[in-house]
């Protein structure tokens, strides 16, 4: 029996990320006897729920059950039946639901109530549905990428498990972009913070981390676009908005009621002499960039240094992983390579935005027009946010790594959330006993 493998005791966990634009279900697995080790949990499945984010179901809550069915059934298939009852299920809702809660706490609770009712019908061990805070979203994203990069492991390796790993224990900062909010989280050089609201302290695997984090509500890519449109329509002379952030020849009618539906546009709201207006694309990166910059108030800063809107931001430190929409957008634009300089990215964006809409549609025939039409804005917004918002420079640009997956697991807050809620990140370094990790007898 020298090399006979013992049957491994595998555990599973499910986290639903209820984002502003869509919901994704993630299934994680890990060997039960190693659950306090770093880097042993990995993602086995991502299931994207068909339809919009859960906050859009506020007037049709009875449809939430059907909406979640396919992905929950997929989880039933992937996870062995013998493990169903033991498998924890968590749902975390992010900025889309934060915005709904700002409008009506009662309506937000109604949505979560129906979510619980729906998820309780499955054989898994449902733990709860809640709206996570922006601070949590930032912190858990930071934990996820550093866990997957092996930054919490005390064992130094002579080899690199992932391309970005520099084989040191310096943690990566986390840059997360969603539809309705964006988060920046990193360990600054200076341990003292001028803004306690932005300070988090962790003890993970026997080491203390003083982390800076901030979540900018309304500065996710979709809400930023609504903000920009609401700002620009204020000065339009008629119901035509010539917009540099859309390709030349692109046309779209927008309802003013849709524009002012979100709390994110309240500061730009005014009575307009029309109910609808038409966006006409003119495809000019430079003008689009200027328009986006007007969303960032940099004139006021009560600290030594700010990002924008008077929010403290310490000097940037170390490497950063940029994930979620930072990655999806830059990957679509083919700009995720480490070799592409910031100047080159800007150059490519200028070229992309100026391409006629008809040409774009032909080149990307398989892409939904709604998404396709917004890549010029989204790419420009990402550049503006990183450079002017967070003060990255042409030099520090090379410290940004656009990451989709690490070791097969998606970068994002969900893994960190599950690790925390299942107590799988010990404060102290676990003592490894000689036989505790033996799989062979």
């Amino acid at each position: 029996t020298q090399n006979k493998a013992l049957p491994e005791n595998i555990k599973y966990g499910i986290v639903l990320d209820a984002g502003s634009s869509h919901t994704s279900l993630y299934i994680y697995k890990w060997p039960a006897e190693k659950e306090n080790d770093t880097g042993v949990v990995h993602q086995v499945e991502e299931c994207r729920v068909k339809g919009p984010g859960i906050s859009k179901y506020v007037q049709k809550v009875n449809e939430i059950g059907i909406y979640l069915t396919d992905c929950m059934e997929r989880a039933r298939e992937v996870i062995p039946r013998s493990q169903h009852q033991e498998t924890p299920v968590y749902l975390g809702a992010t900025a889309g639901m934060r915005l709904l809660r700002m409008e009506s706490e009662e309506l937000a609770d109604r949505v979560l109530d129906v979510v619980e009712r729906s998820l309780s019908n499955y054989p898994f061990d449902f733990q709860g549905a809640r709206i996570i805070t922006g601070q949590e979203e930032g912190a858990y994203g930071w934990i996820t990428i550093n866990y997957l990069l092996g930054k919490f492991s005390q064992k130094t390796r002579w080899f690199s498990i992932v391309p970005y790993e520099t084989n040191n224990q310096e943690t990566f900062g986390a840059l997360d972009l969603g539809g309705a909010s964006t988060q920046i989280t990193f360990v600054p050089q200076n341990q003292t913070t001028e803004s306690p609201d932005n300070a988090l302290q962790f003890r993970l695997y026997g080491k203390d981390y003083n982390v800076y984090t901030h979540s900018f509500l309304c500065y996710g890519k979709d809400q930023a676009l609504w903000q920009k449109l609401a700002k620009d329509i204020q000065v339009a002379s008629n119901e035509i908005l010539r917009d540099p952030c859309f390709h030349p020849g692109y046309k779209k009618v927008v309802n003013v009621s849709d524009l002012y539906k979100t709390p994110c546009t309240k500061r730009f709201e005014m009575t307009l002499p029309f109910q609808q207006f038409e966006i006409q694309g003119i495809g000019n990166y430079q003008q689009c960039h200027q328009s986006v910059l007007e969303l960032f108030n940099t004139s006021y800063c009560p600290y030594s240094q700010c990002a924008f809107n008077g929010i403290f931001l310490p000097p940037l430190q170390g490497d950063f992983g940029a994930f979620s929409a930072f990655y999806f957008v830059m990957n679509f634009l083919n700009l995720t390579s480490e070799k592409v300089s910031q100047e080159k990215v800007t150059e490519m964006m200028k070229k992309f935005c100026s391409q006629p809409w008809e040409e774009i549609k032909t080149s990307y025939a398989g892409v939904k027009e709604k998404y396709l039409s917004e890549y010029c804005f989204s790419g420009t917004y990402i550049l503006s946010l990183l450079l002017q918002g967070y003060h990255f420079t042409a030099d520090s640009w090379e410290h940004i790594h656009f990451i989709g997956k690490i070791q097969g697991s998606d970068a994002g807050w969900t893994l960190g959330y599950m690790l925390n809620l299942t107590n799988m990140i010990p404060a102290e370094q676990p003592l490894s006993t000689p036989l505790s990790h033996s799989t062979y007898v």
Epitope: Q85, D113, E116, G128, R130
Partner: nanobody, 126 residues
Framework: EVQLLESGGGLVQPGGSLRLSCAVS????????MSWFRQAPGKGLEFVTA????????HYADSVKGRFTISRDNSKNTVYLQMNSLRAEDTAVYYC???????????????????WGQGTQVTVSS
């Protein structure tokens, strides 16, 4: 951390009814599964019932099934235990408990991080 305050205990005759309340302050109430445990004189702590954050999942100990009902009112940040057909063996100190993002099933196993109330005495006697 949440704080819990039980009320409604007292002396009741066998076959009678009693309704316990547990008011929760601090924290977002719907994020907590709530539970009732009890401790009879000279005995260990016993699970009675638990309910999920929005009330769709409940668990009961076999000894109270069909007689006790747990419910919650999230607008009042309160969980209730309706006790009917009370018996002498239901005499105990009843403790309210809260666990954040933890299933009622795990509360039943006393797993996870649980916050406890100070308890309310229920005496069933003729």
């Amino acid at each position: 951390e949440v704080q819990l305050l039980e009320s409604g205990g007292g002396l009741v005759q066998p076959g009678g009814s009693l309704r316990l309340s547990c008011a929760v302050s601090r924290g977002t109430f719907s994020e907590y599964s709530m539970s009732w445990f009890r401790q009879a004189p000279g005995k260990g702590l016993e699970f009675v019932t638990a309910i999920s954050g929005f009330g769709h999942i409940t668990h009961y100990a076999d000894s109270v099934k069909g007689r006790f009902t747990i419910s919650r009112d999230n607008s009042k940040n309160t969980v209730y235990l309706q006790m009917n057909s009370l018996r002498a063996e239901d005499t105990a100190v009843y403790y309210c408990a809260a666990a954040w993002q933890t299933s009622p099933r795990r509360m039943m196993q006393m797993a996870g991080s649980i916050t406890w109330g100070q308890g309310t005495q229920v005496t069933v006697s003729s």
